[in-house]
């Protein structure tokens, strides 16, 4: 990872977006064997610890405060040059979060999308943020930035993501900032998981004892496939969240998850999806829809012994 033409490459791990009180490792990649480097901050709110300091390999900065937000560069050690140092590296912007109330993040048309579609992620707040930033978990590069549009006491920005492919699936958060402190970001929005479907073969969905049951009768939905899915996700039409279970290998070489729905109270249309542990936000094609009908006395809800996942958390591993 070289900056080219005697220029080091400055990077941040795990991310350039750092919470107040957190830590970030700044690494200056220069020529092999030349590990010494110096760091400096470009604006006036300098961090005194850098002055005259020489670092090796990487420098762990923290606990960070608002004073650490800003643009950094490094110079690699060049013992035989006139100055003893290389040309300055690329600029690296460190953003410090937790400085304002969190904005809200929504997905239009929704967080569950087919491969190739486009999703609009709308970040909004009643704090008059000048800029909004969108960041995907696990990504070290700078977040996307948009100017907020202010209407009726609300500031918002629409981030267009797409056409969707597996690399764009994941957990998104957005942040806001005010004009005079562009790198001092708000607390993060609640996480929003963007899931891409349609990448693998569809599983099959069946009901035990059958798709038509008496009110009060116990119902279990089974999702299975010859594909070695690690997790199955069960969704019900009209419900915001899905349920998920670990797939279990069966003797007939299929991989299956059984979702107990409990005593039947009213019907609904169900679908299931499979996913792999390595890519928890990339799902298979949907199973064929399964209509579960309840005869007898339907009530307004179906109790769920399977804990439904929250709006977020889909993209975390099941332990």
């Amino acid at each position: 990872l070289m900056g080219g033409q005697d220029k080091p490459f400055l990077s941040a791990r795990p991310s350039t977006v750092v919470p107040r009180g957190g830590h970030v490792a700044l690494q200056c990649h220069y020529r092999r064997g030349f590990n010494n480097f110096m760091l400096y901050k470009e604006d006036r709110s300098h961090v005194p610890i850098f002055h005259g300091r020489i670092f090796q390999e990487s420098f762990i900065m923290g606990p960070v405060t608002t004073a650490h937000a800003g643009t950094y560069r490094c110079r690699g050690s060049r013992p035989h040059s006139l100055t003893g140092w290389s040309a300055p590296s690329n600029p690296l912007v460190i953003m410090v979060t937790g400085n304002h109330r969190k904005p809200s993040l929504l997905a239009h048309p929704g967080p569950l999308l087919k491969s190739g579609e486009t999703v609009i992620l709308q970040c909004w707040s009643d704090v008059m943020f000048e800029h909004f930033f969108l960041h995907r978990e696990g990504i070290s590069e700078d977040p996307s930035r948009l100017v907020g549009q202010i209407h009726d006491g609300v500031s918002k920005a629409n981030f267009s993501i797409g056409p969707l492919m597996p690399v764009l699936a994941g957990t998104y958060r957005c942040y806001g900032s005010v004009p005079h402190s562009p790198y001092q970001l708000s607390a993060p929005s609640d996480p929003l998981d963007i899931v891409i479907t349609g990448l693998y073969e569809k599983p099959s969905l069946s009901a035990q004892p059958g798709p038509t049951v008496q009110a009060g009768e116990n119902v279990t939905l089974s999702c299975s496939s010859w594909s070695s899915y690690d997790i199955y996700h069960l969704s019900r039409e009209g419900e915001a969240h899905e349920r998920r279970l670990r797939a279990v290998p069966k003797v007939n070489r299929t991989f299956q998850a059984d979702f107990p729905l409990g005593p039947a109270t009213h019907g609904g249309t169900y679908r299931c999806f499979g996913s792999f542990r390595a890519l928890p936000c990339v799902w298979s094609n949907s199973s064929d829809p399964l209509l579960v009908s309840v005869t007898g006395n339907p009530s307004s809800s179906w109790p769920s012994p399977t804990e439904p996942s929250s709006k977020s958390g889909i993209c975390r591993h099941l332990h």
């Epitope: 109330r101 004009p179 005079h180």
Partner: antibody, heavy 115, light 107 residues
Framework: QIQLVQSGPELKNPGETVKISCKAS????????MNWVKQAPGKGLKWMGW????????TYADDFKGRFAFSLETSASTAYLQINNLKNEDTATYFC????????WGQGTLVTVST | DIKMTQSPSSMYASLGERVTITCKAS??????LSWFQLKPGKSPKTLIY???RLVDGVPSRFSGSGSGQDFSLTISSLECEDMGIYYC?????????FGGGTTLEIK
């Protein structure tokens, strides 16, 4: 509607301390930073600094570092400006104003420093 | 610090006249500029933010323009209640800095 109501006028001797309050209503207090602005008699406006009402972190302009202190009582939606060791040149009207572009202002508090 | 130079420092104008006040920043401040009106014994009133956005409740005869370093406030048709002192403010960078003010009086 949004209102910032400041405490009344103060007459102080040099060397004393004054604490001015700015009570906010009509909006979520922690949504907007609070700025403080000085207007000396016959002079223009001078920005003193701001306090982040979400984190409580104050930022002071160079001319207002040392004797000046911003603070908050978030539960009462109130910001404070305290001036220690008052000098004659502190005689001025002090305004609080909220938000990044100073959208709403208090009515001002006149502080007179005189022996 | 960014220096804001406001002109004129004072002016007389007739009722119904079009009035323009200018503000020049010592460096690029994008569009992060506000305009305020001060009247004796009253709270300052914010007229414009982000260089050209009218604050809710401010009469439409007030307008702002400009970006970068050069900005102006225009009153399309002067009314009696418009007399007072006008200030610009840059909020692009800390510390915020005000212009020196323009005293507007009726002829």
């Amino acid at each position: 509607q949004i209102q910032l109501v400041q405490s009344g006028p103060e007459l102080k001797n040099p060397g004393e301390t004054v604490k001015i309050s700015c009570k906010a209503s009509g909006y979520i207090f922690t949504n907007y930073g609070m700025n403080w602005v000085k207007q000396a008699p016959g002079k223009g406006l001078k920005w003193m600094g701001w306090i982040n009402t979400y984190t409580g972190e104050p930022t002071y302009a160079d001319d207002f570092k040392g004797r000046f202190a911003f603070s908050l009582e978030t539960s009462a939606s109130t910001a404070y400006l305290q001036i220690n060791n008052l000098k004659n040149e502190d005689t001025a009207t002090y305004f609080c104003a909220h938000g990044p572009w100073l959208a709403y202002w208090g009515q001002g508090t006149l502080v007179t420093v005189s022996t | 610090d960014i220096k804001m130079t406001q002109s004129p420092s004072s002016m007389y104008a007739s009722l119904g006249e079009r009035v323009t006040i200018t503000c020049k920043a010592s460096q690029d401040i994008n569009s992060y500029l506000s305009w305020f009106q001060l009247k004796p014994g009253k709270s300052p009133k914010t007229l414009i933010y982000r260089a050209n956005r009218l604050v809710d409740g401010v009469p439409s005869r007030f307008s702002g323009s400009g970006s970068g370093q050069d900005f102006s406030l225009t009153i399309s048709s002067l009314e009696c209640e418009d007399m007072g002192i006008y200030y610009c403010l840059q909020y692009d960078e800390l510390p915020y800095t005000f212009g020196g003010g323009t005293t507007l009086e009726i002829k």
